[in-house]
Interface confidence: medium
């Protein structure tokens, strides 16, 4: 007779799924907020910085009643690949003056494109449609000058602290609804 | 650098009304989720209300339900707090706050509000 | 009555450890994220630890934040003259569908 049948597969906890994808994305948010700090510290910001080609926000308190799960998950995948992208953009083109960020803007666009694989393999573990491949998009202009590396650095990270905040509340209440 | 102003505060009589401003610097005003919450001479912190960050949502705790109305305009990076029907238990100093998330991460220096006649 | 409970008073002496508890129930602290503030005397509160246990840039990291079940907690360790204020927790509460505070605790250096 052949080999013994493996073990029955056990599908996998949602909620504890979501939870490590929960730890993810605040460990994430932790290196995020230090190294908006550094870049401060290192470049203060003089008022607000913002970057169109980021994208607008998709939380706040007012949407947290209706949230359901498929569209989180597709949003905030969306959204950090987005960022992933403009973090790459950061360190090819963002000037000599962003180097003194390194390694840590690597550490930070390793650990984002860890998550983002995380958020790929829970969406499929929990038999959500899997969003269309993303389409090609635009090349992101190089900075006129360094100071504009710098202003696009602060909106870049802000922006995804944010983002990364907002998921971490996000995602802890779709837990307790699961 | 972050920075929040409030001002507006004072002296009101039990009944009237009053309407507190809070000035945002620092930041892109329009991202973020804003707060009104308070503190009575010598207690705790109070949660007033929220704002989301395109005002489209509101939500207010129920001592203040029906009275008071949170606004912002985005133009102006100013939030504000209507104050209506106000009673001695109102008084307290008000802060506003921002909200990244699930926490109050830069308060305003707060304004005070003595309601009493 | 506030809906989170916090002793009124901890006190320590300088270099010595303190721990702070809150306790809730499961619409807000079991359920949501618990954030921490301090209050120096005469002055607006400030964020202290968020997330249950992240710190904010400039916190130092004598102070941590932790959370089991319904039940969070504050540990300031090589506790200083300058940590004399007072703490408290705050989480969103689902029922109420608003945020809120425990009474705060008034820490005393001695």
């Known amino acids: 007779p052949g080999p013994p049948p493996g073990p029955p597969r056990v599908s996998p906890d949602p909620r504890a799924e979501l939870d490590s994808t929960v730890l993810l994305t605040r460990s994430l948010l932790a290196d995020t907020r230090q190294l908006a700090a550094q870049l401060r510290d290192k470049f203060p910001a003089d008022g607000d910085h913002n970057l169109d080609s980021l994208p607008t926000l998709a939380m706040s308190a007012g949407a947290l009643g209706a949230l359901q799960l498929p569209g989180v998950l597709t949003r905030l995948r969306a959204d950090l690949l987005s960022y992933l992208r403009h973090v790459q953009w950061l360190r090819r083109a963002g000037g000599s003056s962003l180097k003194t960020l390194e390694p840590e803007l690597g550490t930070l666009q390793a650990r984002l494109d860890r998550l983002l694989r995380r958020l790929q393999l829970l969406m499929s573990r929990l038999a959500l449609p899997q969003p269309p491949p993303d389409p090609p998009a635009p090349p992101l202009a190089p900075p006129s000058s360094a100071w504009g590396g710098i202003r696009a650095a602060h909106a870049i990270l802000g922006g995804l602290h944010l983002t990364l905040d907002w998921a971490v509340r996000g995602l802890l209440l779709l837990k307790t609804r699961l | 650098e972050v920075q929040l102003l409030e001002s507006g505060g004072g002296l009101v009589q039990p009944g009237g009304s009053l309407r507190l401003s809070c000035a945002a610097s620092g930041f892109t005003f329009s991202h973020y989720d804003m707060n009104w919450l308070r503190q009575a001479p010598g207690k705790g912190l109070e949660w007033v209300g929220v704002i989301s960050y395109d005002a489209s949502n509101k939500f207010y705790a129920d001592f203040v339900k029906g009275r008071f109305t949170i606004s912002r305009d985005n133009s102006k990076n100013t939030l504000y707090l209507q104050m209506n029907s106000l009673r001695a238990e109102d008084t307290a100093v008000y802060y506003c706050?921002?909200?990244?998330?699930?926490?109050?991460?830069?308060w305003g220096q707060g304004t005070l509000v003595t309601v009493s006649s | 009555q506030s809906v989170l409970t916090q002793p009124p008073s901890a006190s320590g002496t300088p270099g010595q450890r303190v721990t702070i508890s809150c306790s809730g129930s499961s619409s807000n602290i079991g359920n949501n994220a618990v954030n921490w503030y301090q209050q120096l005397p005469g002055t607006a509160p400030k964020l202290l630890i968020y997330y249950d246990d992240l710190l904010p840039s400039g916190v130092p990291d004598r102070f941590s934040g932790s959370k089991s079940g319904t039940s969070a907690s504050l540990a300031i360790s090589g506790l200083r003259s300058e940590d004399e204020a007072d703490y408290y927790c705050s989480a969103w509460d689902d029922s109420l569908s608003g945020v809120v505070f425990g009474g705060g605790t008034k820490l005393t250096v001695l």
């Open positions: 706050a921002r909200t990244p998330g699930s926490h109050f991460d830069y």
